[in-house]
C-alpha cells in the first residue's frame, strides 16, 4: 500500500480510466453472499480485464471474480464482513486500479415483492402490503422501505412514504377519486449495514372509487 500517491489529485487521476463501482448482497443464495462490480464507463474495453478481491476473507487471501457480460461477480461464503477488502482491476496479473471497500457499507438489498393494495370501504382507506426476503435473513434484517405512488396520468409526480414495516395505510381522502394509481416499493439497509437502494418491486395498479355521498353527508 505504501507506494500509492499521497496527493489527492494524483490519486483520483489514477482511477479515472478504470473507475468502477460495486455492491454486495448478503445471504443472497442461502448462506452465500455475492459481490458485483462494473466499470462506470460502459465503453471500457473489458477484454483481458479481471477483478480480484483480497483481504477480509475467511480461509483465503484473495478471490477472483467471474465475468458475466459487462459485470464481474463473486458468490461465496468467504466474506469476513469485518475490515476492508482491496478490490482491484487487473490485466495480466498487474493491478490497474484498486479500491479499499468495507463490504458492509455497499449492501444492496433484494427488491421487495408481492406488493398489493386492498381497499377498505368501511375505513375509507387503502392498505398497502408487500413482502421482503430480508425478514428471513440473519444479517441485513432491518430495512427502510420507500413506497412511491402516483396517479397514472402524472408521469413524474411521485409521492414517497418511508417506513420500516411492510404495511402502509393510505387514506382515501388523500387520493383523487376515480383515478388509476401506480405504486411500487424499494428498500435500503438500516441499522449498521449501509449501501444502496434495491431495485424497485414490480408496480401494482389500483383504481380509487368514486366519491359516494349519501344525501346530507359532508365531503370527507
Amino acid at each position: 500500500e505504501s507506494g500509492y500517491a499521497q496527493n489527492g489529485d494524483l490519486e483520483d487521476a489514477e482511477l479515472d480510466d478504470y473507475s468502477f463501482s460495486c455492491y454486495s448482497q448478503l445471504e443472497v443464495n442461502g448462506s452465500q453472499h455475492s459481490l458485483t462490480c462494473a466499470f462506470e464507463d460502459p465503453d471500457v474495453n473489458t477484454t483481458n480485464l479481471e477483478f480480484e478481491i483480497c483481504g477480509a476473507l475467511v480461509e483465503v487471501k484473495c478471490l477472483s471474480f467471474r465475468k458475466l457480460q459487462e459485470i464481474y461477480f463473486i458468490e461465496t461464503k468467504k466474506f469476513l464482513l469485518i475490515g476492508k477488502s482491496n478490490i482491484c482491476v487487473k490485466v495480466g496479473g498487474k493491478s490497474l486500479t484498486c479500491k479499499k471497500i468495507d463490504l458492509t457499507t455497499i449492501v444492496k438489498p433484494e427488491a421487495p415483492f408481492d406488493l398489493s393494495v386492498i381497499y377498505r370501504e368501511g375505513a375509507n382507506d387503502f392498505v398497502v402490503t408487500f413482502n421482503t426476503s430480508h425478514l428471513q435473513k440473519k444479517y441485513v434484517k432491518v430495512l427502510m422501505h420507500d413506497v412511491a405512488y402516483r396517479q397514472e396520468k402524472d408521469e413524474n409526480k411521485w409521492m414517497h412514504v418511508n417506513l420500516s414495516s411492510t404495511k402502509l395505510t393510505l387514506l382515501q381522502r388523500n387520493l383523487q377519486p376515480e383515478a388509476m394509481y401506480e405504486i411500487k416499493v424499494r428498500s435500503i439497509p438500516d441499522h449498521y449495514f449501509k449501501g444502496f437502494w434495491s431495485e424497485w418491486s414490480p408496480s401494482y395498479y389500483f383504481r380509487t372509487p368514486e366519491i359516494n355521498n349519501s344525501p346530507g353527508e359532508m365531503d370527507p
Partner: antibody
Framework: QVQLVQSGAEVKKPGASVKVSCKAS????????LHWVKQAPGQGLEWIGG????????AYNQKFKGKVTLTSDRSTSTVYMELSSLRSEDTAVYYC???????????WGQGTTVTVSS | DIVLTQSPASLAVSPGQRATITCRTS??????????MHWYQQKPGQPPKLLIY???NLESGVPARFSGSGSETDFTLTINPVEAEDTANYYC?????????FGGGTKVEIK
C-alpha cells in the same frame, strides 16, 4: 510503514482553542477513516469522532458536538481536531487512530497531551 | 449508549499461566456471526494497540497467545501463556452503535 504522527503537547488557558494535527503516511490517505480518542489522566478511552478523508464526511460522539471540529487536508494527508472553549476537564491525551474496519482502530498516533490551566 | 463492563478491574498472573478478562455489554453487539467487539492493549506512556477485532480475529503481528471469543453480550480475552511483557491495561470496545464505547479497562500485572 504505516504511521500516524501527531503534533506536540499544548498548554492552553481556559476559554482558548487548540488545533491538534495528525499526519498519515505509508498508505493511501483516502482509503481509511481517521478517528480521535480522548484519554483523561488515569482514565479510560473515549471515542470523540471520526472523519472520512475521501469525502470530508464526519461523525461525532454527541457528547463532543460543539466542542470538537474535525477537518482533513488531502494535499498533506493530515487530519485536524480543533477543541474550542477549553476547560480543565479537556485536559487529556488525545489520540488519532485509523479505522481498519467499522469501527475498530488498527493504527494509532503517539498521542498529544493538551493541558488546560489558568 | 452501550455500556461495557470489564472484569476483573485488575489481576495478577504468574508467567506461563492463563489470564482471562471478560467484557459484558448492556445490549447485544452481534449481528448473527458478526461480533462487533474488539480488544486493545495499552502499556504506560504508549498508545493503545489493537489485539483482536471482530471478537476473535487476531490482528496481524500479534502473538498467538492472545485469543478472543464470545457473542451477543459476553466476550472474553485470553492470554495463554502470559509473559512478562504482557503487563498492561486491556480495553474492550464495541462498534455496533455510535457512540463507539470502551470498557473501563483491566490492569494485568505479572507476579
Amino acid at each position: 510503514q504505516v504511521q500516524l504522527v501527531q503534533s506536540g503537547a499544548e498548554v492552553k488557558k481556559p476559554g482558548a482553542s487548540v488545533k491538534v494535527s495528525c499526519k498519515a503516511s505509508g498508505y493511501r490517505f483516502t482509503d481509511y477513516e481517521l478517528h480521535w480518542v480522548k484519554q483523561a489522566p488515569g482514565q479510560g478511552l473515549e471515542w470523540i469522532g471520526g472523519i472520512d478523508p475521501k469525502t470530508g464526511g464526519t461523525a461525532y460522539n454527541q457528547k463532543f458536538k460543539g466542542k470538537v471540529t474535525l477537518t482533513s487536508d488531502r494535499s498533506t494527508s493530515t487530519v485536524y481536531m480543533e477543541l474550542s472553549s477549553l476547560r480543565s476537564e479537556d485536559t487529556a491525551v488525545y489520540y488519532c487512530a485509523r479505522s481498519g474496519g467499522r469501527w475498530y482502530f488498527d493504527v494509532w498516533g503517539q498521542g498529544t497531551t493538551v493541558t488546560v490551566s489558568s | 449508549d452501550i455500556v461495557l463492563t470489564q472484569s476483573p478491574a485488575s489481576l495478577a498472573v504468574s508467567p506461563g499461566q492463563r489470564a482471562t478478562i471478560t467484557c459484558r455489554t448492556s445490549e447485544s453487539v452481534s449481528i448473527h456471526l458478526l461480533h462487533l467487539m474488539h480488544w486493545y492493549q495499552q502499556k504506560p506512556g504508549q498508545p493503545p494497540k489493537l489485539l483482536i477485532y471482530g471478537a476473535s480475529n487476531l490482528e496481524s503481528g500479534v502473538p498467538a497467545r492472545f485469543s478472543g471469543s464470545g457473542s451477543e453480550t459476553d466476550f472474553t480475552l485470553t492470554i495463554n501463556p502470559v509473559e512478562a511483557e504482557d503487563t498492561a491495561n486491556y480495553y474492550c470496545q464495541q462498534s455496533i452503535k455510535d457512540p463507539y464505547t470502551f470498557g473501563g479497562g483491566t490492569k494485568v500485572e505479572i507476579k
